[in-house]
Interface confidence: medium
């Protein structure tokens, strides 16, 4: 199988006329050693190919998890999950954007463009980097959490003497605390402007309120539709 | 109004292959999220997942029959088709289609079932 | 797979009583369950998905309850068409598994 051939992520399917959103399976891969992996592809929004690596918008998962799960990933994917920052730093490898969606309680919409997304590997503590950001959604709320390792409730990389997994109920890229906590718990219409370990995005309604619905997706740079 | 029915052979011969029609109205299999399922159930016995297939041709099995069973679609006659073979007589039973929509696989509206005895 | 166990096997109750179904997951699949209702000679029924969202036209008094492996159906007062078989669903991952039924029939 040459490299053109390789079906490596959602892109690779869409330039392979998958052009219906919806759930596909990759195939293993011996030569980048990655696993089969089913992933949730959107083939629509602003010419398609993203692989979607997180998702919230039914609260029937919790996200207040452990390094491991965090690592393999978690949840139903074809509802809220995680992709698994072992699969997530694989897909990155490569020059990669990020595209952050949100809606409010209200159905408005915003969204967040990262020009460059990488996490680093397991040794690295699954460490985020991202580049230019653009999009709608009030002020980069991801932008203090750049450069910053992945924390769970059982392992601490945050830069702070609280432990901000612990406080913010999620894994995440803590800093000391959060600007943004897109792994925060799931908090209902009535519940979901009253705490601060909601899922929150401070840059557009402030911290403490929680959010309907997110999702987390990449594509490569080089994306052409 | 939302309806499912299935059609296909009363009774089939073991070894022979099975082909079972679901038709439904009231919904379209183009529609993001939507898909149609198989259901069996052996008299007096529990319901059995047998396959399913989404808008986007999103294939799924039962892995301990996925050798045996090929399930297709044609969206715009809206009705889906899935076809078993080498049937034994254990695969007596009856089938049911069932509409899964949304995002969490169930199934929320069904048809009525269609008996299926395999006898020689 | 996620095997699916639900008990009792069968349950005899009386009009007006509360009765309580349980299903219990052999892996945790947070709150993906279904609960199914069916009528002999009749297809199975949706009543409750996610858990605990009662299917639109579902009367009130069916309830359900849990989250990871153990889950349950309620019904707060039986009524005559309450006695049927019973089946759990996860609705997690593929492959989709039914737990065995409960059968509720008239003491």
């Known amino acids: 199988q040459t490299s053109a051939d390789a079906i490596y992520d959602c892109s690779s399917l869409y330039q392979k006329n998958y052009r219906i959103s919806g759930v596909y399976r990759l195939p293993s891969n011996d030569f980048l050693g990655s696993p089969e992996l089913e992933v949730f592809c959107d083939m629509e929004t602003k010419g398609g190919g993203w692989t979607v690596i997180q998702r919230r918008k039914s609260g029937l998962v919790s996200f207040y998890r452990d390094w491991k799960q965090y690592k393999q990933g978690f949840g139903s994917i074809r509802g809220d999950f995680w992709l698994g920052n072992e699969h997530i730093h694989r897909l990155s490898r490569q020059p990669t954007r990020l595209r952050v969606e949100m809606e409010d309680w209200e159905g408005t919409v915003r969204y967040a463009e990262y020009s460059h997304f990488v996490l680093s590997n397991e040794l690295n503590s699954y460490r985020l980097f991202l580049g230019n950001y653009s999009g709608n959604a009030g002020n980069d709320a991801l932008y203090y959490h750049n450069n910053t390792a992945f924390s769970t409730k059982d392992k601490d990389n945050d830069n702070c003497l609280d432990k901000c997994a612990q406080l913010r109920k999620g894994g995440y890229w803590y800093n000391c605390c959060t600007d943004s906590n897109l792994n925060g718990v799931y908090y209902r219409l009535g519940e979901h402007d009253k705490h601060l370990d909601g899922i929150t995005w401070y840059g557009w309604h402030g911290a403490n309120y929680s959010l309907k619905r997110v999702e987390m997706k990449i594509r490569p740079e080089d994306f052409k539709p | 109004q939302i309806t499912l029915k299935e059609s296909g052979p009363t009774l089939v011969k073991p070894t022979q292959t099975l082909t079972l029609t679901c038709t439904f109205s009231g919904f379209s299999l183009s529609t993001s999220g939507v898909g149609v399922g198989w259901i069996r159930q052996p008299p007096g016995k529990a319901l059995e997942w047998l396959a399913l297939?989404?808008?986007?041709?999103?294939?799924r099995y039962s892995p301990s029959l996925k050798s045996r069973l090929t399930i297709t679609k044609d969206t715009s006659k809206n009705l889906v088709v899935l076809t078993m073979t080498n049937m034994d007589p254990v695969d007596t039973a009856t089938y049911y289609c069932a509409r899964d929509y949304g995002d969490y696989w169930f199934f929320d509206l069904w048809g009525r079932g269609t008996p299926v005895t395999v006898s020689s | 797979d996620i095997q699916m166990t639900q008990s009792p096997s069968s349950l005899s109750a009386s009009v007006g009583d509360r009765v309580t179904i349980t299903c219990r997951a052999s892996q945790g699949i947070s709150s993906y369950l279904a609960w199914y209702q069916q009528k002999p000679g009749k297809a199975p029924k949706l009543l409750i998905y996610a858990a605990s969202s009662l299917q639109s036209g579902v009367p009130s008094r069916f309830s359900g309850s849990g989250s990871g492996t153990d889950f349950t159906l309620t019904i707060s007062s039986l009524q005559p068409e309450d006695f049927a078989t019973y089946y759990c669903?996860?609705?997690?991952?593929?492959?989709?598994?039914f737990g065995g039924g409960t059968k509720l029939e008239i003491k």
């Open positions: 669903q996860q609705s997690f991952s593929t492959p989709l598994t």
């Open positions: 297939i989404y808008w986007n041709d999103d294939k």
